[in-house]
Structure formats: structure tokens, C-alpha cells
């Protein structure tokens, strides 16, 4: 048993059929010796009485907010959450499996830029009594600090009759320079509790392996004469780290058929500007990577051909 | 990539072309150790990330581009400690700190050159015969160092009598690829920012 | 002793707005892990869940009803509200309230219901 | 919304008997089920929640079981007082649903 926060305890224990369950010993906060008395949740009925009280813990029955009383009075509240470990492995009903880019990947990150913020989030299918908390730091045996602001509800979507909730934090680096050559991963680490029960979630990663930029930006083309090509032309955005003669970027700029069959014409570059064939009904589409480490691409900037 | 490239002029710094060969290389070496070495613990997630330049060069404080020199959290350390000449200072109103710059990014490619060359020793009395260094990756450090043209002793190459532990080697040789990578992002970074200059 | 009593208005003409209040006895609203739902039944039929709101106001509704409800708590009368906005004949049904705490999570106290009739 | 099918819709039992009620859910709800007996024009009454466990004060021989999408609701040895429309009810995702109920009667 550990204690979560202030009154909250969480109990671990082996979830299989008949298992022997935990023995935990509560203890009154108060400086009264006699006349107190335990309850489960907002029941009546007396559990035990004395300063402390001992009980076996085997399931979520058993799990709860014990108080103890004297003469009708509360003095104090434990509140008891329970960790199911099943073969050996923590459970982990809470958050969906999003698979990417592995499997057992629960909390997925993304930063715009080398600045030490970034923004994790993750997907579940329950959508009451759930709350989470998010602690962060660079490194686990020295930590330096990171801070998290409180996880929000980002986005709702319908999985065939399910429906999916989407939640979202966003964490800073106290103190982070965008050259820096990290050594040390970010761990993220999720508590997650559905009613009484409690479950905990983390990933590990460096900026630079998360990378991921906004979409270009001012995406303009221009017709040259005579010709059916297009000079076409963008900014870095505006989120992108600087100076961008450090912080370079490298585009990819395509041109795609109104069909999703017909050909895309690809080409790379390290410049803010391309010359390429526009069709008719087509679009040119720009996204942007890092130049010198190849984390993810960014979504595409896209305009009309016509 | 393997698409068309629109590639860059290499324009005024005769560095930055060397720095890109560089980067190149060593992304080639480690994608193939990766590959190679798929039973080792060889990924960014697997291996602890050591710096064999920590406490002896300040690449990444030396060479911070001036808009960054601003920023508290940049300037834990800058020791300025480092021989100035070289051929890449193609341009007079090249500042002391410059020279310092490319002074710590000859030094760092000497330590690894003799990391590497040690290492490919070891590699090579290997029976498996599984996994040697690019001798490419091996040559664009050479010409980048060139190029830096810095005067400094020579470090002899460290040869060991005992037989080696080829698997503490092939370990030892994806710590040093992931390091030398993310040196190798910070030298084209600089390099980049030094052609814009 | 733990009691929750329901009052509304008996009969509400189709369109109007229904006000429906649970009135706690026995234990507060404003205490930490305190909840309370509403859930109606149609004469002869089954039980529907409404709304349920917490302690610190965080409340949660019924999807297919959530543009008609709202659910608001006064803590100094110890009263949850529920409001249901444009009846019709099919909402007629007994509403009742019911306490629902995060520690065990389940509604263990319910009032005793009030019979809503909508007709004109 | 999750639908939670309960069966069968009424069943009639002599005292002493064994009754077993199933209820089974369209997606899997853990183990957040409660299971509630309500008497003619009364309110219900909580019986089991977390799928098996016993409210304060329920008699033992009243039991639930069940993980995921299949639940059983047992009165081990039914009494006269038992008599009643029994309900369960999902609250692991909004809205909260509950089966259709299964009346109880004495044969």
C-alpha cells in the first residue's frame, strides 16, 4: 500500500480467483485512544473499532473511503484505491492500446519545435468517474523538472458503436535550450483512476525523436508565362523553431490528381520555393521535416491548382 | 529519399558540404548496425547515451548561434578553451567565438576518429565477422577535419592487449553511432547557420 | 438517517419547461465525493438515467436528452434541480433522485419518486 | 450507448428454489455493474454493485457475478419477500443504461 495523495492509498494486489488479497491496517488521524469507530463508504455498520483498524483487502468490495467516527463525529477519511496485477502484469483497462508506432502504446507525444514543450495524449472508452494525473521530468534517477498543466478532454469521436474520448496534456521543460544535445529521455508518467480503481501509464522519450512541425505556412503559387508550370512558395510556420538557419527544415512538395489513383508527382527540397507541372483539378500540397534528424513530417499545407 | 532533390548551392563555407557527407554516413552506419546488430540492444530506446567529448569539448555551447545566447537554460556551460585557425574561417569579420566553434567540432571529430579506428581494430578479430565501420563514414570524418585544417596533437590510437569482448564491443559501437549522429545534427546545424551568415 | 425526497408539479402541458427538485436530508452536497442522479420510469416500464451531477459541479447527462436537461445543485438548501425543457406526452413517467457517492459508486439511496403526468 | 439485455423478462420460481438472472452487455463494461430490485410502486434498492458485492444490510443469499459483457444475478434460496421486478445497470460509460428487468413471482 502507498499512499497516492493526501487520504487517497492505493493497494496492490494479484487479481486471480481465491487470491489471499492484501492485509492493510488503516490508522485513525486523530490524537483521541478511545471511543472511535470504522466505516465503509456511507454506511452504517461498524467494521471495527479502536485507533486502527485491519482488513483484507481482496476486491474492488473491499476498496473505498473508510472513516472513522467518535460519538457521531468524523475524525478522518482513507480512501482506498485498488492496482490489479494479473499474471505478473499491471492492468491496464483504463486507456486504449493505440498500436503506433508499437504495440502497448498508451500515451502517444508530439513537440512543435525544439522549445521543451510538447503535448502527450491518449485514448479511452470510459467517459465518467475518471480523473488522471500527469507528472513529468527529464530523467529518473536526478530528475530535472518539467511541468504539466491538468489533462482536458480534447476530443470525442464515434468508433464504429463505441465511442472514443481523446485527452490531452501539455508540458513544458523548466529549463530547456533548443541546441541542447539531450542525454537523458523525458519520462511522462499518467495515474489514472475509474472509480476505485487505479492505474498508471508512462512513456519515455527524447524532443528530438518527437519532433513533429507544423504544416508549412503562405502557400502560395504563382503561374510563370508561357508555361503550365508553378512556381510554388511557403514559410517556415511560425511555431518552428529559430533561427531557422539553425533549426532547418526540408519540404516535400507534391502534386496530387483530384483521384486518389492517379500519380503524385513528389520533389524535395531544402528551399521555400519549387517550380513544378500544375494539372488541371489537382492540388499542390507542401509538408516539412526536420532537415538534419528525421522525426515525423508534418501534416500537409494544400491549395488548389486552379 | 531516394526522389528528386532540389539540392543546395554549397555556397561560401567550404565546411558545410563536408558536414552533410558526414551526417549522411554516420546515418548509414547506424541504420546498418541497427540492422545488423538486431539481437543487440542497438535502439535510441535500448542503449544508455553516452558523450565521449562530455567534459572535454563545448560544441553545442561554442557554437550556439547568437539568437540563443539569450536564453539562460543555453549557457550552463561555456568553456572557451580552444585553438583559433583553421581553413574554414573563409572570412576575416570571422569572430573569436567562431573559431572557438569549429576549434571544438575538429576536436570532437578527432576523438571519434580515434574511437572508430579503435573500435573497427577490435571489430576485425572478430571470427563472426558480423559488423565493421563504413570506411566511407570513416573518410568523410577525415575530410571534414581537413577542411577545419586545425593544428593539434595528433592522439595516438588505443590499442589493448587483452582479447576483446565482442559483444561489449558491438554494444559499445551503437552507443558511440547514436552519440556521434546526434554530434554530427549539431555540427550540420552549425554549419548551416555559419553558410547563412 | 439518509433520505431523499423528489418535488415537481404533478402535471405539465406538452412544450412547457418541467422543474424537478431533490431535496437531501442526512448528508451534504457540499461534502467531497457527493453525487446525485436523476432517473425516470415510465408507467410500466423500465428505468432511464437522466443526469447525475458531483459535489464540485462537474455533471454528466443522458446524450439523447442532453439539449433538453439541466441539472444544477444549491448547496446552501442542500437541493439538486433538474430542469427538462419542451415536454411531451412520452415524458411522462415517476423521476426519481438518488445518491450516488465516489466511494462505492453505485446509487444506494433513492427517494421515493414523484409522478409527472404530461397532458394538456 | 452500451444496451444491457437482460434475461429472462419474467420467470416464476417456487420458495426455496434457485433463481438466476443473466444480463449481458453490447461492449464490455469491466465489472461496473450494480444490480437493483424494485417492488411495486416503490423506488428500487440497491442489491450488489462492482458486479458482486454485497450492499450494506442485502441478505447473503442474494449474489452476483460476472466480467466484461456477462453478468448472473442469483437469489441462492427465494423467500416471499422477493417478489419484485429486478433490474441491472451499467455505469462504466454514459449514458448509464439499465436492462429491461426481470419480473419475479411466486409459483
Known amino acids: 500500500i502507498w499512499e497516492l495523495k493526501k487520504d487517497v492509498y492505493v493497494v496492490e494486489l494479484d487479481w486471480y480467483p481465491d487470491a489471499p488479497g492484501e492485509m492493510v491496517v488503516l490508522t485513525c488521524d486523530t490524537p483521541e485512544e478511545d471511543g472511535i469507530t470504522w466505516t465503509l463508504d456511507q454506511s452504517s455498520e461498524v467494521l471495527g473499532s479502536g485507533k486502527t483498524l485491519t482488513i483484507q483487502v481482496k476486491e474492488f468490495g473491499d476498496a473505498g473511503q473508510y472513516t472513522c467516527h467518535k460519538g457521531g463525529e468524523v475524525l478522518s477519511h482513507s480512501l482506498l484505491l485498488l492496482h490489479k496485477k494479473e499474471d505478473g502484469i499491471w492492468s491496464t483497462d483504463i486507456l486504449k492500446d493505440q498500436k503506433e508506432p508499437k504495440n502497448k502504446t498508451f500515451l502517444r507525444c508530439e513537440a512543435k519545435n525544439y522549445s521543451g514543450r510538447f503535448t502527450c495524449w491518449w485514448l479511452t472508452t470510459i467517459s465518467t468517474d475518471l480523473t488522471f494525473s500527469v507528472k513529468s521530468s527529464r530523467g529518473s534517477s536526478d530528475p530535472q523538472g518539467v511541468t504539466c498543466g491538468a489533462a482536458t478532454l480534447s476530443a470525442e469521436r464515434v468508433r464504429g458503436d463505441n465511442k472514443e474520448y481523446e485527452y490531452s496534456v501539455e508540458c513544458q521543460e523548466d529549463s530547456a535550450c533548443p541546441a541542447a544535445e539531450e542525454s537523458l529521455p523525458i519520462e511522462v508518467m499518467v495515474d489514472a483512476v475509474h472509480k476505485l480503481k487505479y492505474e498508471n501509464y508512462t512513456s519515455s522519450f527524447f524532443i528530438r525523436d518527437i519532433i513533429k512541425p507544423d504544416p508549412p505556412k503562405n502557400l502560395q503559387l504563382k503561374p510563370l508565362k508561357n508555361s503550365r508550370q508553378v512556381e510554388v512558395s511557403w514559410e517556415y510556420p511560425d511555431t518552428w523553431s529559430t533561427p531557422h538557419s539553425y533549426f532547418s527544415l526540408t519540404f516535400c512538395v507534391q502534386v496530387q490528381g483530384k483521384s486518389k489513383r492517379e500519380k503524385k508527382d513528389r520533389v524535395f527540397t531544402d528551399k521555400t520555393s519549387a517550380t513544378v507541372i500544375c494539372r488541371k483539378n489537382a492540388s499542390i500540397s507542401v509538408r516539412a521535416q526536420d532537415r538534419y534528424y528525421s522525426s515525423s513530417w508534418s501534416e500537409w499545407a494544400s491549395v488548389p491548382c486552379s | 529519399r531516394n526522389l528528386p532533390v532540389a539540392t543546395p548551392d554549397p555556397g561560401m563555407f567550404p565546411c558545410l558540404h563536408h558536414s552533410q557527407n558526414l551526417l549522411r554516413a554516420v546515418s548509414n552506419m547506424l541504420q546498418k548496425a541497427r540492422q545488423t546488430l538486431e539481437f543487440y540492444p542497438c535502439t535510441s530506446e535500448e542503449i544508455d547515451h553516452e558523450d565521449i567529448t562530455k567534459d572535454k569539448t563545448s560544441t553545442v555551447e561554442a557554437c550556439l548561434p547568437l539568437e540563443l545566447t539569450k536564453n539562460e537554460s543555453c549557457l550552463n556551460s561555456r568553456e572557451t578553451s580552444f585553438i583559433t585557425n583553421g581553413s574554414c574561417l573563409a572570412s576575416r569579420k570571422t569572430s573569436f567565438m567562431m573559431a572557438l566553434c569549429l576549434s571544438s567540432i575538429y576536436e570532437d571529430l578527432k576523438m571519434y576518429q580515434v574511437e572508430f579506428k579503435t573500435m573497427n581494430a577490435k571489430l576485425l578479430m572478430d571470427p563472426k565477422r558480423q559488423i565493421f565501420l563504413d570506411q566511407n563514414m570513416l573518410a568523410v570524418i577525415d575530410e571534414l577535419m581537413q577542411a577545419l585544417n586545425f593544428n593539434s596533437e595528433t592522439v595516438p590510437q588505443k590499442s589493448s592487449l587483452e582479447e576483446p569482448d565482442f559483444y561489449k564491443t558491438k554494444i559499445k559501437l551503437c552507443i558511440l553511432l547514436h552519440a556521434f549522429r546526434i554530434r554530427a545534427v549539431t555540427i550540420d546545424r552549425v554549419m548551416s547557420y555559419l553558410n547563412a551568415s | 438517517e439518509v433520505t431523499l425526497r423528489e418535488s415537481g408539479p404533478g402535471l405539465v402541458k406538452p412544450t412547457q419547461t418541467l422543474t424537478l427538485t431533490c431535496t437531501l436530508y442526512g448528508f451534504s452536497l457540499s461534502t467531497s465525493g457527493m453525487g446525485v442522479s436523476w432517473i425516470r420510469q415510465p408507467p410500466g416500464k423500465g428505468l432511464e438515467w437522466l443526469a447525475h451531477?458531483?459535489?464540485?459541479?462537474?455533471?454528466y447527462y443522458n446524450p439523447s436528452l442532453k439539449s433538453q436537461l439541466t441539472i444544477s445543485k444549491d448547496t446552501s438548501k442542500n437541493q439538486v434541480v433538474l430542469k427538462l425543457t419542451s415536454v411531451d406526452p412520452v415524458d411522462t413517467a415517476t423521476y426519481y433522485c438518488a445518491r450516488r457517492t465516489r466511494v462505492n459508486y453505485a446509487m444506494d439511496y433513492w427517494g421515493q419518486g414523484t409522478l409527472v403526468t404530461v397532458s394538456s | 450507448d452500451i444496451q444491457m439485455t437482460q434475461s429472462p423478462s419474467s420467470l416464476s420460481a417456487s420458495v426455496g428454489d434457485r433463481v438466476t438472472i443473466t444480463c449481458k452487455a453490447s461492449q464490455s463494461v469491466s465489472n461496473d455493474v450494480a444490480w437493483f430490485q424494485q417492488k411495486p410502486g416503490k423506488a428500487p434498492k440497491l442489491l450488489i454493485y462492482y458486479a458482486s458485492n454485497r450492499y450494506t444490510g442485502v441478505p447473503d443469499r442474494f449474489s452476483g457475478s460476472g466480467y466484461g459483457t456477462d453478468f448472473t444475478f442469483t437469489i441462492s434460496s427465494l423467500q416471499p419477500e422477493d417478489i419484485a421486478t429486478y433490474y441491472c445497470?451499467?455505469?462504466?460509460?454514459?449514458?448509464?443504461?439499465f436492462g429491461g428487468g426481470t419480473k419475479v413471482e411466486i409459483k
Open positions: 451531477i458531483w459535489w464540485d459541479g462537474d455533471n
Open positions: 445497470q451499467q455505469d462504466y460509460n454514459s449514458p448509464w443504461t
